[in-house]
């Protein structure tokens, strides 16, 4: 599923991401935009043999199990395929674990490079939330 901007903002708010660990909703929408272009089925392979999955591009070396990443920790205790569902519950629950891990949203390279320090509220402007 490819979400609309406001559609995703509403879904993320419904799942409790707004101000989760101090990160406003705009941060999450911005991260999703530059990680996956709002596409729940996005997959991208990394040079270390791991793969990033879903709307927030969650990595198989640490957070989920795709059955083929050497030394996978699976800290979210889920199959990576669950992160590709049109229902973003699994991605959100795992993202909450990631953002609580110590580095906050710096764990997402796209957020660090494209969203951090910018007017992230623009990503939810005009949305009925």
């Amino acid at each position: 599923k490819v979400f609309g901007r406001c559609e995703l903002a509403a879904a993320m708010k419904r799942h409790g991401l707004d101000n989760y660990r101090g990160y406003s909703l705009g941060n999450w929408v911005c991260a999703a935009k530059f990680e996956s272009n709002f596409n729940t089925q996005a997959t991208n392979r990394n040079t270390d043999g791991s793969t990033d999955y879903g709307i927030l591009q969650i990595n198989s070396r640490w957070w989920c199990n795709d059955g083929r990443t050497p030394g996978s920790r699976n800290l979210c205790n889920i199959p990576c395929s669950a992160l590709l569902s049109s229902d973003i519950t699994a991605s959100v629950n795992c993202a909450k674990k990631i953002v609580s891990d110590g580095n906050g949203m710096n764990a997402w390279v796209a957020w660090r490079n494209r969203c951090k320090g910018t007017d992230v509220q623009a990503w939810i402007r005009g949305c009925r939330l």
Epitope: Q41, A42, R45, G67, R68, P70, L84
Partner: antibody
Framework: QVQLQESGAEVMKPGASVKISCKAT????????IEWVKQRPGHGLEWIGE????????YYNEKFKGKATFTADTSSNTAYMQLSSLTSEDSAVYYC?????????WGQGTTLTVSS | DIELTQSPATLSVTPGDSVSLSCRAS??????LHWYQQKSHESPRLLIK???QRASGIPSRFSGSGSGTDFTLSINSVETEDFGMYFC?????????FGGGTKLEIK
Amino acid sequence: QVQLQESGAEVMKPGASVKISCKATGYTFTTYWIEWVKQRPGHGLEWIGEILPGSGSTYYNEKFKGKATFTADTSSNTAYMQLSSLTSEDSAVYYCARGDGFYYYWGQGTTLTVSS
Amino acid sequence: DIELTQSPATLSVTPGDSVSLSCRASQSISNNLHWYQQKSHESPRLLIKYASQRASGIPSRFSGSGSGTDFTLSINSVETEDFGMYFCQQSNSWPRTFGGGTKLEIK
């Protein structure tokens, strides 16, 4: 137990297309990548690409882009590979395998013969 | 693409002999190297995963070693059922690649 059952041997004419199937049983089909491998005598084993059935995400070896197309039907736990514009170079045994980095589980192979 | 070079191409041995098969990668692949045995008209069978881990059901006479670019599959006291083709495969990067194979034949 995990099993991958491939469709039977095919004899096709040059220029035609063929669709090979791989039915998976014994595990959660949507969770694991299905990979496709080509074997020709004297050419060893070649990785064609992969599909994650749960999402339809696909990756192809550059060499096989435009030649192979992967699809999956999660209702029947079956992965498919279509090969188009067949030539004699496509005559080979084609295997599906479950993608665990390594390949512990393999199909029995589908022999494709392209001949006029 | 990572190239895997296997040597020798053919190895002629007598049952009871011990043998070593080599697989060399064109660049470092850590331990992401796997070994397969294939007999005529059969699918490949996984022997060793991640350079040194024996796959389920594989006899202890098979062992693997190596890291980086140089890998070895050893068979201690070859049995008649061990004759066939042996392939290595890397999973360090895409595309996945296989070695050209070593044929183990009876002398």
